[in-house]
Interface confidence: medium
């Protein structure tokens, strides 16, 4: 799981992914549900080795969160070829994995 620390790093990660699915976890250190799902998010990154997993701390990267129109945490966004192909909010493990399977 790659930690994103700037808008440039986010754009570069999307570019570098090419055709691969990119899953972005927008979270915050003070967000309880975010902490709860984080280990699961990390386990998915091992399970789905052909998928790129990114983490964005909304406090450290307010510009990325703002550009991606993140309104609550955690929010998961899914990108392919730089295009957003899915999104949902909430610490829902099953929906997270189901969405990855749908889009991979």
């Amino acid at each position: 799981v790659k930690q994103i620390e700037s808008k440039t790093a986010f754009q570069e990660a999307l570019d570098a992914a090419g055709d691969k699915l990119v899953v972005v976890d927008f979270s915050a250190t003070w967000c309880g549900p975010c902490k709860m799902i984080k280990p699961f998010f990390h386990s998915l990154s091992e399970k789905y080795s052909n998928v790129i997993f990114l983490e964005v701390d909304v406090d450290d990267c307010q510009d990325v969160a703002s550009e991606c129109e993140v309104k609550c945490m955690p929010t998961f966004q899914f990108y392919k070829k730089r295009e957003k192909v899915g999104e949902f909010s909430g610490a829902n493990k099953e929906k997270l994995e189901a969405t990855i399977n749908e889009l991979v």
Epitope: N92, K93, E94, K95, E97, N101
Partner: antibody
Framework: EVQLQQSGAELVKPGASVKLSCTAS????????MHWVKQRPEQGLEWIGR????????KYDPKFQGKATITADTSSNTAYLQLSSLTSEDTAVYYC??????????WGQGTSVTVSS | QIVLTQSPAIMSASPGEKVTMTCSAS?????MYWYQQKPGTSPKRWIY???KLASGVPARFSGSGSGTSYSLTISTMEAEDAATYYC????????FGAGTKLELK
């Protein structure tokens, strides 16, 4: 306890339509995808499609595109499967299912649809 | 769309016998799922993530495989294992195999 309760058996005439229901209890259907699966008599399982009840987004096996329409009503926690222009090929048991990953899978008891004149 | 081919279609085994059934995918997949179904009942998830046993499934069952080739094995057949087993993949368009009917000899 999670349960999926399906509507009762249907006997319908060729050319007609039928709408089956699947009411969930023990969880909110907005939190997952609801799937429908077909099983013809003495045959295997066929995935029809699924809905994300949170936004109404659907996906179908191309084979069932135009035949099946999946909808959901989050206020009643119910998913629906509508089948149109019925023929004898549509005679089957139809299951709604919560196909999960690390958590438990759940299936409805099935609804038998018989197409006969 | 990924096609799953199960073999054999029908097989029989005596109590205590080792049983292996296979499922071949037309394209590489990451994980296989297996379901058990008995007549007049809904399918039950039996194995998930290729090799993990669902809750309540006896330890005599095991699953293995990768890429396009997967299998379900029963180390010692018991009467209650007689059923039809379906393999299932969950890519963008989920599909099921045609099933292997396991009968008690």
């Amino acid at each position: 306890e999670v349960q999926l309760q399906q509507s009762g058996a249907e006997l319908v005439k060729p050319g007609a339509s039928v709408k089956l229901s699947c009411t969930a209890s023990g969880f909110n259907i907005k939190d997952t995808f609801m799937h429908w699966v077909k099983q013809r008599p003495e045959q295997g399982l066929e995935w029809i499609g699924r809905i994300d009840p949170a936004n109404g987004n659907t996906k179908y096996d191309p084979k069932f595109q135009g035949k099946a329409t999946i909808t959901a009503d989050t206020s009643s926690n119910t998913a629906y499967l509508q089948l149109s222009s019925l023929t004898s090929e549509d005679t089957a048991v139809y299951y709604c299912a919560l196909l999960q990953y690390s958590a438990m899978d759940y299936w409805g008891q099935g609804t038998s649809v018989t197409v006969s004149s | 769309q990924i096609v799953l081919t199960q073999s054999p279609a029908i097989m029989s085994a005596s109590p205590g016998e080792k049983v292996t059934m296979t499922c071949s995918a037309s394209s590489r997949i990451s994980y296989m799922y297996w379901y058990q179904q008995k007549p007049g009942t809904s399918p039950k998830r039996w194995i998930y993530d290729t090799s993990k046993l669902a809750s309540g499934v006896p330890a005599r069952f095991s699953g293995s495989g990768s890429g396009t080739s997967y299998s379900l094995t029963i180390s010692t057949m018991e009467a209650e294992d007689a059923a039809t087993y379906y393999c299932h993949q969950r890519s963008s368009y989920p599909t099921f195999g045609a099933g292997t009917k396991l009968e008690l000899k």
